[in-house]
């Protein structure tokens, strides 16, 4: 069914209408929209009370509502694909007519967590309880109903219509009937405020057709923000009643003349307006002309007023209403500025944090600070970022350049640094010599020593060598030399100073080198490609490193 019974309450600059009828939220919104409104907002406790009043009026008239709980659509909806947001007062819902989110909410229970379906909000009325201002209708969210299938829809809806202003109800000084027709097509004979552009039809008399007089008025804007009917004096006055009927229709005082005529007057501090009925305060602020949180400030001699806004807001073009100031226009922040109602907040870019001199300043985050460094070794903080470095003998590694990897000085394009054998270690290297040769004091060259078939002179003890932290490479590592059939290195005669390489084996006894002092009885063999007997020192280079070990008896040992 369509929307049937209706009730209306007008207050401030808005009218609320309540309707019964099983419509979907979309149909209800369409109904409100056809008459120039929207499903009602409930943006404050005061507005909730206005809506409650119009619902109470509807329920007094509506006998058909037999359900104990009744629901009425309001204009709070969440579109398909928009998720419930528990961090917000409106939980991700928004008002159909637009406008900013407000802190007021009155949810009935925890909301269903969903994103896919469009969700709509209704006011939940417990009809078994009296409607009290202290017990405002709760908000209930759910599916939005289906057009054309009343079974899936709720009992009714509330519309809201906003206006430039309102006229006071017409005052009758004698018997008669006023019928107001609003721009949203509602007729009523009792409105506490009548919206701009409404028509008033006044039928004077006590019902006798002969004595009935009719008057027609329109609520007009007489001056900016001043609305009236353009009538003067009380309507339907009757000498028979004088001031005794409805105070002569006067707003405050009624003064009778001896001939049954009467005049309206005002109490001290008030003045009579042009309609000769209504009294207005001599203090122009008493009518609360300022809106949106603006404060009314009296001008000199109490003649006029100006509206003043709270900090973070400014007057709009009407000079009556406050609108948010976008403080971010003035670039008050060092980096990012986020405008908020009545203020703003500063935010910092990634790599920065709030701090430093001045409001809204950002200071560099020291990623290298104790306990938070992402680098394996050296960390240098930079403005908004950082970079990692490695100690001598290591190079940066890893996808993000935070790890350090050992440089193998014994291989590479420049060739090894050592004259003869080269042993890579963590972050460094050491030289050694072939049997019959000894390491010169410079630690690089080899000189002919006493003839010996013992092991080659090896590197010093491990504990004498510096090792870098944070490396992800195994310790002191070299590869095993090429082996002959009996497990000994292949040997072929060479002339001059031999060069150890996979294709140029040397003539000597099995190559053995002393293991570090911590591992007695274990020999280490240098990698064939890591050991050279070259004619002088050469440049170090990076490379791989792996280890083979050999026992005293010539058998393979375990690493």
């Amino acid at each position: 069914t369509g929307a049937d019974t209706e009730a209306v309450v007008c207050v401030g600059t808005a009218c609320y209408t309540a309707h019964s009828g099983k419509l979907s939220a979309a149909e209800a919104q369409n109904h409100c929209n056809q008459n120039g409104g929207n499903l009602a907002t409930v943006k404050s406790k005061e507005e909730a009370q206005h809506v409650q009043r119009v619902l109470a009026q509807l329920l007094r008239r509506e006998a058909a509502l037999t359900a104990r709980m009744s629901k009425f659509w309001i204009g709070l909806q969440r579109e398909k694909g928009k998720c419930l947001d528990p961090s917000l007062p409106l939980k991700g819902f928004s008002w159909v007519g637009g406008g900013e989110d407000t802190p007021y909410s009155n949810w009935h229970k925890e909301l269903r967590n969903s994103c896919i379906s469009k969700r709509c909000v209704s006011l939940l009325l417990d009809l078994s309880q009296p409607l009290l201002p202290s017990r405002l209708p709760k908000w209930s969210e759910g599916p939005c109903g289906s057009p054309g299938s009343p079974g899936s829809n709720i009992e009714g809806f509330v519309c809201k219509f906003s206006f430039k202003g309102m006229c006071r109800p017409l005052a009758l000084g004698g018997p008669g009937q006023v019928t107001y027709t609003t721009p949203f097509q509602t007729t009523s004979s009792s409105l506490e405020a009548v919206p701009f552009a409404s028509a008033a039809n006044v039928a004077c008399g006590e019902g006798d057709k002969d004595e009935t007089q009719s008057h027609y008025f329109l609520c007009k804007e007489k001056a900016p923000d001043v609305f009236d009917w353009g009538s003067s004096g009380p309507l339907c006055v009757s000498p028979k009643y004088g001031c005794n009927f409805n105070n002569g229709g006067c707003h405050q005082d009624c003064f009778e003349g001896g001939d049954g005529s009467f005049l309206c007057g005002c109490r001290p501090g008030f003045r009579l307006l042009d309609d000769l009925v209504t009294c207005a305060s001599r203090n122009p602020c008493s009518s609360s002309p300022c809106r949106g949180g603006a404060t009314c400030v009296l001008g000199p001699h109490g003649k006029n007023y100006t509206c003043r806004c709270p900090q973070g807001y400014q007057l709009d073009s009407s000079q009556l209403d406050c609108v948010d100031v976008d403080e971010c226009q003035d670039s008050p922040c060092a980096q990012e500025c986020v405008n908020t109602p009545g203020g703003f907040r500063c935010e910092c870019w990634v790599g920065y944090e709030p701090g430093g001199p001045g409001e809204g300043a950002c200071q560099d985050v020291d990623e290298c600070a104790l306990g938070r460094s992402p680098c394996a070794q050296g960390c240098t903080n930079t403005d908004g970022s950082f970079h990692c470095s490695c100690e001598e003998g290591y190079v940066l590694a890893g996808e993000d350049g935070t790890q350090c990897q050992d440089v193998d000085e014994c291989v590479g394009p420049g060739g090894p640094l050592c004259d003869s054998l080269c042993f890579n270690t963590q972050g460094s290297f050491h030289c050694g010599c072939l049997p019959g040769w000894v390491l010169a004091p410079n630690g690089v060259s080899c000189t002919m020593g006493p003839v010996s078939l013992g092991p080659p002179s090896g590197p010093p003890d491990e504990e004498d060598k510096g090792e870098k932290e944070g490396s992800t490479v195994p310790r002191a590592a070299t590869a095993s030399p090429t082996r002959g059939p009996e497990g000994t290195p292949k040997a072929t005669p060479t002339t001059s100073r031999p060069s150890l390489s996979s294709d140029a084996p040397i003539t000597s006894a099995p190559l053995k080198m002393l293991a570090p002092s911590g591992s007695p009885g274990v020999w280490r063999e240098p990698s064939i490609h890591h050991a050279t007997a070259a004619s002088g020192p050469q440049e170090p280079a990076g490379g791989d490193s792996s280890v083979a070990t050999q026992n005293n008896d010539g058998t393979d040992g375990q690493k």
Partner: antibody, heavy 120, light 108 residues
Framework: QVQLVQSGAEMVKPGASVKISCKAS????????MHWVRQTPVYGLEWIGG????????AYNQNFKGRVTMTRDTSISTAYMELSRLTSDDTAVYYC?????????????WGQGTLVTVSS | EIVLTQSPSSLSASVGDRVTITCRAS???????LHWYQQKPGKAPKLLIY???NLAFGVPSRFSGSGSGTSYTFTISSLQPEDIATYYC?????????FGSGTKLEIK
């Protein structure tokens, strides 16, 4: 506790359709949306779409529009995902998933997965 | 649709290492709608971190997340052997939901 149990592996021919089920237990079926995600070696994890069991409303990834249909049977707390006009590219593990009491589409509960192989 | 690019695509680290994975979005994503998952071979993904930095129920505190806008980071403060898995970021800012391409984490 929340459990999502999916139907078994399927071997289907190109051009055919497949319908996978996901039976929910441990909560009120209509309280949580049910979503479907598939995983292939080439495309990784792909969201196919979701259904609101309370209303039957659906949301589909445009890449699957016209080929995917999601339904539910609230009486047996089961959601279904049907994919038609299959090609070898649809060979994947298909998961049903929902976000339980968490917000913002953080998928907290997952089915065990259903392997669908499209081969002639 | 919003494309999420994860880096690195794979990484090898040692037990006890600090591991960081980055997820970059092709356009801004609300931090509430950015989540991280762990997937082990043959298993369904498991939610680790929701809304950028909140640990899912039962997830160890060595996992953490941060970021905003288009840049998000997932960190394991001290890598454990059981953390070997592929890690995915996921976002929602209007349909479709999208996932990152994944970061495969291995132990050295």
């Amino acid at each position: 506790q929340v459990q999502l149990v999916q139907s078994g592996a399927e071997m289907v021919k190109p051009g055919a359709s497949v319908k996978i089920s996901c039976k929910a237990s441990g909560y009120t079926f209509t309280d949580y949306e049910m979503h479907w995600v598939r995983q292939t070696p080439v495309y990784g994890l792909e969201w196919i779409g979701g259904i609101d069991p309370e209303t039957g409303d659906t949301a589909y990834n445009q890449n699957f529009k016209g080929r995917v249909t999601m339904t539910r049977d609230t009486s047996i707390s089961t959601a279904y995902m049907e994919l038609s006009r299959l090609t070898s590219d649809d060979t994947a593990v298909y998961y049903c998933t929902n976000y339980g009491n968490l917000y913002y589409y953080a998928m907290d509960y997952w089915g065990q997965g259903t392997l669908v192989t499209v081969s002639s | 649709e919003i494309v999420l690019t994860q880096s690195p695509s794979s990484l090898s680290a040692s037990v006890g290492d600090r591991v960081t994975i980055t997820c970059r979005a092709s356009s801004s994503v609300s931090s509430s709608y950015l989540h991280w998952y762990q997937q082990k071979p043959g298993k369904a993904p498991k939610l680790l971190i929701y809304s950028t930095s909140n640990l899912a129920f039962g997830v160890p505190s060595r996992f953490s997340g941060s970021g905003s806008g288009t840049s998000y980071t997932f960190t394991i403060s001290s890598l454990q052997p059981e953390d070997i898995a592929t890690y995915y970021c996921q976002q929602y800012s209007g349909y479709p939901l999208t996932f990152g391409s994944g970061t495969k984490l291995e132990i050295k």
